[in-house]
Interface confidence: low
Amino acid sequence: LPAQVAFTPYAPEPGGTCRLREYYDQTAQMCCSKCPPGQHAKVFCTKTSDTVCDSCEDSTYTQLWNWVPECLSCGSRCSSDQVETQACTREQNRICTCRPGWYCALTKQEGCRLCAPLRKCRPGFGVARPGTETSDVVCKPCAPGTFSNTTSSTDICRPHQICNVVAVPGNASMDAVCTSTSPTRSMAPGPVHLPQPVSTRSQHTQPTPAPSTAPGTSFLLPVGPSPPAEGSTGD
């Protein structure tokens, strides 16, 4: 004959444990039912009555089977630099992620605690490493033969065009200008191609410090155009 199924509450065998979705109530000394996600324990079990569960109130949740007396509060509303990617429901907390063009400088268990704007590389500098959801853009000076004339968190250094006759030589922040004869594209030295970010936001493995500067300050645009030839004093 099959073993008899015990209904909660029941006393476990000596040294035994309660079954899945049950917990051992120390006061009643019985195995009792847990409450499902979206509910909490309104009345704890006794030797003769099982746990009484109730739905979570608005703006509260439980994500797991539980026997908590109160549901957890959902996190505060997403800030202006974030978007809500998961709403607060009875079964899950609100999740806020950084909006496009920003990255998460300070993570929390789920979502992001603090967003910071992605660094923009100034003219003369290109993206060496795109930002990611949790890391800032890394800029690098454009190597000889390459340039970037934009202030951008996605643009890389591009090769100068090669002219039959050069009107104006290129530098790190400006392409070469050719006379009327048609130019050809150079194969510039050094790596100039870089994978573009998966999205505008998904672009520092750089160990993501908290933002080293307040949003919107000029310091987020780290370094500027063409480095000098060795020994020059700049402009």
């Epitope: 003369g124 500027g224 480095p227």
Partner: nanobody, 120 residues
């Protein structure tokens, strides 16, 4: 006349330390973003670190993070780069450069550089 003069470079054993200084004059140092950039033997320029005017905000390249510390003394108009646990890869000419804020975000002023050689 704008001047940026780097000093403190030299030959050092791998694992050793150096402190670079950059004495600035001729522009409003205390309101300028300051940057260290290095040029390797292959003529590749690499941004190393930068610091905002009040010295509270700093950034570092991955390759130097945890080993280099950028700082400044506005009263002396001097920028510093403390370099510890040096590696042979750190061998380069180190330039300090300034963004005085009026330049549209470019590094308008550059020093002549100081050579750092790290031997194994």
């Amino acid at each position: 006349d704008v001047q940026l003069v780097e000093s403190g470079g030299g030959l050092v054993q791998s694992g050793g330390s150096l402190r670079l200084s950059c004495a600035a004059s001729g522009f409003p140092f205390s309101s300028s973003d300051m940057t260290w950039v290095r040029q390797t033997s292959g003529s590749v320029f690499e941004w190393v670190s930068d610091i905002n005017p009040d010295g509270q905000n700093t950034r570092y390249a991955d390759s130097v993070k945890g080993r280099f510390i950028i700082s400044r003394d506005n009263a002396k108009s001097t920028l510093y780069l403390q370099m510890d646990s040096l590696k042979t890869d750190d061998t380069a000419v180190y330039y300090c450069a300034a963004d005085p804020g009026s330049s549209g975000g470019s590094l308008s002023y550059w020093g002549k550089g100081t050579l750092v050689t790290v031997s194994s």
